[in-house]
């Protein structure tokens, strides 16, 4: 970190990687919740035209696919993996790909994935061959 760039503000240390370099934020698709036509496919594109620089360097990309009796939605955001999202821990946040895993939610089918490469939540993967662990 160069000396002229403040290392600490209000005791909040700048995020650095393990060689001391400043951690730069990643890029994520960020359309919040949109209606989706993604259904019964091995993978889908988000169809989100908004790519944002995540606000915080520690944030990762997240996608949430939900289906109920009325519609299908896809949510794309940046989120801090230290914090739960929709009451679930982002256990796959270090993955370079967004591999969807089903979560238990009453009244709907709910899949979520997180990943840590640029725009990785643009391509969401449901295919079983990628899933090495059982859904929650």
């Amino acid at each position: 970190i160069p000396p002229h760039v403040q290392k600490s503000v209000n005791n909040d240390m700048m995020v650095t990687d393990n060689n001391g370099a400043v951690k730069f934020p990643q890029l994520c698709k960020f359309c919040d919740v949109r209606f989706s036509t993604c259904d019964n496919q091995k993978s889908c594109l988000s169809n989100c035209s908004i790519t944002s620089i995540c606000e915080k360097p520690q944030e990762v990309c997240v996608a949430v696919w939900r289906k109920n009796d009325e519609n299908i939605t896809l949510e794309t955001v940046c989120h801090d993996p230290k914090l739960p999202y929709h009451d679930f821990i982002l256990e796959d946040a270090a993955s370079p790909k967004c591999i969807m895993k089903e979560k238990k939610k009453p009244g709907e089918t709910f899949f979520m994935c997180s990943c840590s490469s640029d725009e990785c939540n643009d391509n969401i993967i449901f295919s079983e061959e990628y899933n090495t662990s059982n859904p929650d």
Partner: nanobody, 122 residues
């Protein structure tokens, strides 16, 4: 030796415009991803814009989207930030920055200019 030198900062009224420049040397500028990062008084770093190379794709933080434009002139080894519709909350030191892999997976060296101060006030 990598050097990044920002210029173009100053005092501007709300609603005004400024164009920042960053002169780069010591590396192959035309192949590098470049960033503009700012630090408001008493605040942390805010990464506001990135431009890739090749291709020149540009990205913005929500706080500046639609108001700021990042660009580069590879023939002049210079990075630019055009700032329009400036607000008081844009007051900050603006840095240009680059990073390159260390060779160890997932880690980077980062390089920073000395910064240029932008003050938006009436």
């Amino acid at each position: 030796e990598v050097q990044l030198l920002e210029s173009g900062g100053g005092l501007v009224q709300p609603g005004g415009s400024l164009r920042l420049s960053c002169a780069a040397s010591g590396f192959t500028f035309g192949t590098e991803q470049m960033w503009w990062v700012r630090q408001a008084p008493g605040k942390g770093l805010e990464f506001i814009s990135r431009i890739d190379s090749p291709g020149g794709r540009t990205y913005y933080a929500d706080s500046v989207k639609g108001r700021f434009t990042i660009s580069r002139d590879n023939s002049k080894n210079t990075l630019y930030l055009q700032m329009n519709s400036l607000r008081a909350e844009d007051t900050a030191v603006y840095y240009c920055a680059k990073r390159r892999p260390t060779g160890v997976s997932g880690t980077f060296y980062d390089y920073w200019g000395q910064g240029t101060l932008v003050t938006v006030s009436s």
